[in-house]
């Protein structure tokens, strides 16, 4: 395929894999997709750190990358014909796996507008610098490449795979080797969390001799949201080592019998779970792990807990604290939306008032309604506004254009309207003549 899986990091409910290989963005996405994932999202600082960790793992194994400034594709792309939107954090780009626009971004430099071709984003790694959590890889935007021509400095890509849940790694109570095979076809002996539907092959023994036993387990859902291997007791136990090897594979306490056998135990306030290895708090909520108004909710068997937020709030990335939901992101209002702690309120533009079908709707204010008109004479209601008009012989006046002022027809822009004398009246005028002259039937001339 032109790409090698070199590194994997699993955390929360997702795994990230880093691959080296000079592939175009489309080829990289296809590679991730074939195994059930997508090019990685980087939707938060925390996720950026996970991606950085998997890239650091890759770089430790990769002898020498050709470019000092190396680029690795992530799943942020902008289709041809879709223009840059500088007001948005993602600048009009979107995640290949779908999902909402996210507030986090880490652009390398100001983006140039170009709608004529598809654009793709890669993470820019300066290999002359150590990868530090405080210095997260910057986002670099450029052409997406084509087969055989991935683009300058493209050295690989990062995939993301999401799962229902994860199992804890298997604990060995004696010499042996665990090999995990994940659903995305990666094998590893060291995962801090093992994704649902992964297989674990355990070969017990010192390695130089023939293995004495081997075991096979699958990470499965044992009960709603409870993911476990279904193994009971420590694996690869050896009377030779007792509790001295990896604490007997026990989560907390290990107790040796005189015959070389041993049992796992738990500290006060904890209890041993069905796997006879792991300890869980008798009541995980008793330590008040949830913050910021979050309520602690016990999971099945009292094994775990989740924090639940009041309405209008959601859990932050730590899953322990509540943060306000910005309901305005979903555009619930017809016109203006104001986010408030725990909720939101809709407001209407000037010239509109709340009302009409649907929540948050606005309807036009009829400024010309009886007893409400701001106009001195005529009033015409318009959508969101109004305009005043004046009867013949009057013109709009006043700063706000609501008053009517008599037109002095005697000094009209077309010159004098009367041949001789002109008398202005409210809203009109009439002509007159000097003594000895008579106003003609046309009301203008004097004869």
């Amino acid at each position: 395929t032109g790409a090698d899986t070199e590194a994997v990091v699993c955390v929360g409910t997702a795994c990230y894999t880093a691959h080296s290989g000079k592939l175009s963005a489309a080829e990289a996405q296809n590679h991730c997709n074939q195994n059930g994932g997508n090019l990685a999202t980087v939707k938060s600082k925390e996720e950026a750190q996970h991606v950085q960790r998997v890239l650091a793992q890759l770089l430790r194994r990769e002898a020498a990358l050709t470019a000092r400034m190396s680029k690795f594709w992530i799943g942020l792309q902008r289709e041809k014909g879709k223009c840059l939107d500088p007001s948005l954090p993602l600048k009009g780009f979107s995640w290949v796996g779908g999902g909402e626009d996210t507030p986090y971004s880490n652009w390398h430099k100001e983006l140039r507008n170009s709608c004529i071709s598809k654009r793709c984003v890669s993470l820019l790694l300066d290999l002359s610098q150590p990868l530090l959590p405080s210095r997260l890889p910057k986002w670099s935007e450029g052409p997406c490449g084509s087969p055989g021509s991935p683009g300058s400095n493209i050295e690989g890509f990062v995939c993301k795979f999401s799962f229902k849940g994860m199992c804890r790694p298997l604990a060995l109570g004696g010499p042996g080797q665990v090999t995990y095979t994940t659903p995305f076809q990666t094998t590893s002996s060291s995962l801090e969390a093992v994704p649902f539907a992964s297989a674990a092959n355990v070969a017990c023994g010192e390695g130089d001799k023939d293995e004495t036993q081997s075991h096979y387990f699958l990470c499965k859902e044992k009960a709603p949201d409870v993911f476990d291997w279904g193994s009971s007791g420590p694996l690869c136990v050896s009377p030779k080592y007792g509790c001295n090897f990896n604490n007997g594979g026990c989560h907390q306490d290990c107790f040796e019998g005189g015959d070389g056998s041993f049992l796992c135990g738990c500290r006060p306030g904890f209890r041993l779970l069905d796997d006879l290895v792991t300890c869980a708090s008798r009541n995980p909520c008793s330590s008040s792990p949830c913050r910021g108004g979050a309520t602690c909710v016990l999971g099945p068997h009292g094994k775990n807990y989740t924090c639940r937020c009041p309405q209008g709030y959601q859990l932050d990335s730590s899953q322990l604290d509540c943060v306000d939901v910005d309901e305005c992101q979903d555009s619930p209002c017809a016109q203006e939306c104001v986010n408030t702690p725990g909720g939101f309120r809709c407001e209407c533009w000037v010239g509109y008032e709340p009302g009409g079908p649907g929540e948050g709707a606005c309807q036009d204010v009829d400024e010309c309604a009886l007893g409400r008109s701001p106009c001195a004479q005529g009033c015409t209601n318009t959508d969101g506004s109004f305009h005043c008009s004046c009867e013949e012989g009057y013109v709009l006046a006043g700063e706000d254009g609501t008053q009517c002022q008599d037109v002095d027809e005697c000094v009209g822009p077309g010159g004098p309207l009367c041949d001789s004398l002109c008398f202005n009246t409210q809203g009109s005028f009439h002509c007159g003549c000097l003594p000895g002259w008579v106003l003609a039937p046309n009301g203008v001339s004097c004869t």
Partner: antibody
């Protein structure tokens, strides 16, 4: 389509053992829990165990632990339920049932009648 | 073990009339993930049980929409809007939140 076909009726003496089979077809046998449920004559339903054929992981109702053994043969997509030390109160219809992703028991075998009588 | 009480034991209904069966559990079946792991099964005379409703309110494939499920964390109801002759049998509620999975005692629906 998903099918679970169970072995035929059995008549057993108290103290003996019985082994009921359940052949699955129409789905990925290794990837779903297979439950065993029994129903005594004129009584309700009672869950007594399950197996995950993918790796042979089992869970038992504590009431039957030690007397029941569940096994599965992936090569033939067949699950087995063996109940030992039979007593007259084990007389019942035994069902094998697939568990789906929502934990529902969505497909049931036709049932196997086990009669324990001296 | 989670214990459940199903009522009534027997339910005679006239065809075309509605019917309602209740099930009460000794603890909440609402998981912290927001899903309620409550199920309803029907065992028609001489047949294996069949799934009617999963996770409290979702209709299983092929089940007529005259059946509906509702409830809170511990109290649940199965409703049949208009009973038909083919609906006779024993209805069971069940929980799959915690091992061992448990069933209610059953409600026998018969036609008047």
């Amino acid at each position: 389509q998903v099918q679970l076909v169970q072995s035929g009726a059995e008549v057993k003496k108290p103290g003996s053992s019985v082994k009921v089979s359940c052949k699955a077809s129409g789905y990925a046998f290794s990837s779903y829990w297979l439950n065993w449920v029994r129903q005594a004559p004129g009584q309700g339903l009672e869950w007594f165990g399950r197996i995950y054929p993918g790796d042979g992981d089992t869970d038992y109702n504590g009431k039957f632990k030690g007397r029941v053994t569940l096994t599965a043969d992936k090569s033939t997509s067949t699950a087995y339920m063996e109940l030992s030390s039979l007593r007259s109160e084990d007389t019942a219809v035994y069902f094998c049932v697939r568990g789906d992703g929502y934990w529902a028991m969505d497909y049931w075998g036709q049932g196997t009648t086990v009669t324990v009588s001296s | 073990d989670i214990v459940m009480t199903q009522t009534p034991l027997s339910l005679p209904v006239t065809p075309g009339e509605p019917a309602s069966i209740s099930c009460r559990f000794s603890q909440s079946l609402l998981h912290s993930n927001g899903i309620t792991y409550l199920y309803w099964y029907l065992q028609k005379p001489g047949q294996s049980p069949q799934l009617l409703i999963y996770t409290m309110s979702n209709l299983a494939s092929g089940v007529p929409d005259r059946f509906s499920g509702s409830g809170s964390g511990t109290d649940f109801t199965l409703k049949i809007s208009r009973v038909e002759a083919e609906d006779v049998g024993v209805y069971y509620c069940a929980q799959n939140l915690e091992l061992p999975w448990t069933f209610g005692g059953g409600t026998k629906l018969e036609i008047k």
